[in-house]
Interface confidence: medium
């Protein structure tokens, strides 16, 4: 039950996170005009990954797309790439995790396959979240650098009569959305990985080991009697795993996943 809850919650958290990453990527407010200690202008500038906008005092907004690809800063291209990779990985992770959900039955899919898919989607969510966090952080770093550069220019370039007040940009709403969304996707991924451990079948069956006594040709299967008499774990639909020989006591001390059902 706990495994199902962890897996389901991981899926939902990741879903919200990926929706947030998509929203952040599409948002225009990655950087917004810094209004603090600046002359009050009749227009407000803000920029996204794909276009820049100008909002007039009347509320009328005009946006222009970045129609050039080669003319854009390499950092902006890198941020775009990171966000897109994050979205793609997250989307694939979501698709995989849907089939991995314990509450969804697809044919005779074995629990081990579900466990593998849960782990795969978890890793994908983790990488997706990291990509989003990295992308947003790179952009934020770029803003901080440009902010202080333009601040220095504002105070050094005032020798003449004419002042050219540079438009300084600060963190926009999309950065915070991106950080939170990336964090949620990361948390969701970790939860999926944790759920995977609970989903993985316990190694209660072992490969047959032949013991040849002189003059006899008898194969002895350790634990075989226990499995067949129904005292141990239910072996239905379970693969026989290679594992180190364990004593009867050791086997009993590890509860199987079916003890939680």
């Amino acid at each position: 039950m706990a495994v199902t809850a962890c897996q389901g919650l991981g899926f939902v958290v990741s879903l919200i996170g990926i929706a947030g990453i998509i929203a952040a990527t599409c948002m225009d407010q990655w950087s917004t005009q810094d209004l603090y200690n600046n002359p009050v202008t009749a227009v407000f500038n803000y920029q996204g990954l794909w276009r820049s906008c100008v909002r007039e005092s009347s509320g009328f907004t005009e946006c222009r797309g970045y129609f050039t690809l080669l003319g854009l800063p390499a950092m902006l291209q890198a941020v775009r790439a990171l966000m897109i990779v994050g979205i793609v990985l997250g989307a694939i992770g979501l698709l995989v995790s849907i089939f991995a959900l314990k509450c969804i039955r697809i044919g005779s899919m074995e629990d081990s396959a579900k466990a593998n898919m849960t782990l795969t989607s978890g890793i994908m969510f983790i990488v997706s979240g990291l990509c989003a966090i990295a992308g947003v952080s790179v952009f934020a770093n770029m803003l901080v650098t440009n902010f202080w550069m333009s601040t220095a220019n504002m105070y050094t370039g005032m020798g003449g009569m004419v002042q050219t007040v540079q438009t300084r940009y600060t963190f926009g709403a999309a950065l915070f959305v991106g950080w939170v969304a990336g964090g949620l996707t990361l948390i969701g991924g970790v939860m999926m990985c944790i759920a995977c451990r609970g989903l993985a079948p316990e190694e209660t069956n072992y490969k047959a080991v032949s013991y040849h006594a002189s003059g006899h040709s008898v194969a002895y299967k350790p634990g075989g009697f226990k499995a067949s008499t129904g005292f141990g774990s239910n072996t239905k639909n379970k693969k026989i795993y290679d594992g180190g020989a364990r004593t009867e006591d050791e086997v009993q001390s590890y509860p199987s996943k079916h003890d939680y059902v």
């Epitope: 005009q33 002359p39 009050v40 202008t41 009749a42 227009v43 500038n45 803000y46 920029q47 820049s52 906008c53 100008v54 007039e56 005092s57 009347s58 509320g59 009328f60 005009e62 222009r64 004419v162 002042q163 050219t164 007040v165 540079q166 438009t167």
Partner: antibody
């Protein structure tokens, strides 16, 4: 068509307050901003302040403490209130409509204000 | 506040002549966001309210004759009338339409010889 009409007291005594109304037609105050501008006799134009469609206001920094701009969207009226009037406040007072893109595209005919005892 | 300086304060011309007046601002009126210069030119004839001629420094308002041309960027702007007509005699004002408070230039008076 777009029209703006200013109406004021005409004559005000020094240190008194002024209230001028700008009644607009042909457009909605919820869509466009309105600015107030004055012009002393034989002199240039001086911007007083603006009230935008969303209600945000900006004022001339030299007159900020004496000025107040408000509006009544339902009556299509914009009000200019100014206190502690002096003789140098004698001027023609205009209200003008801002386009979406902010420039002043339509002006009223103006109302004359004389500050005299 | 942004100071708008217009020159000359008055111009005496003959009909058909080309005339250029200047407007300088103490701060750049160029918005980096859309690369537009927020400077507007107005014409005021005696006894009338001002009328818009040019916005964004160079965009002619609809209905304005094409003999009126605005140019310039940043802090230096100019208004050119290619062939002055009698009806062009008026006072021309430039307006900083970018920084609050909005500020007008002192005006350039265009007179006939």
């Amino acid at each position: 068509q777009v029209q703006l009409k200013e109406s004021g007291p005409g004559l005000v005594a020094p240190s008194q307050s002024l209230s001028i109304t700008c009644t607009v037609s042909g457009f909605s105050l919820t869509d466009y901003g309105v600015s107030w501008i004055r012009q002393p006799p034989g002199k240039g134009l001086e911007w007083l302040g603006v009230i935008w469609n969303r209600g945000n206001t900006y004022y001339n920094s030299a007159l900020k403490s004496r000025l107040s701009i408000s509006k009544d969207n339902s009556k299509s009226q914009v009000f200019l209130r100014m206190n502690s009037l002096q003789t140098d406040d004698t001027a023609m007072y205009y209200c003008a409509k801002h386009d979406f893109l902010r420039f002043l595209d339509y002006w009223g005919q103006g109302t004359t204000l004389t500050v005299s005892s | 506040d942004v100071v708008m300086t217009q020159s000359p304060s008055s111009l005496t011309v003959t009909a058909g002549e080309k005339v250029t007046m200047s407007c300088k601002s103490s701060q750049s009126l160029l918005n980096s966001g859309n690369q537009k210069n927020y400077l507007t030119w107005y014409q005021q004839k005696p006894g009338q309210p001002p009328k818009i001629l040019i916005y964004w420094a160079s965009t002619r308002e609809s209905g304005v004759p094409d003999r009126f041309t605005g140019s310039g960027s940043g802090t230096d702007f100019s208004l050119t009338i290619t062939s002055v007509q009698a009806e062009d005699l008026a006072v021309y004002y430039c307006l900083n339409d970018y920084y609050y408070p909005l500020t007008f230039g002192a005006g350039t008076k265009l007179e006939l010889k």
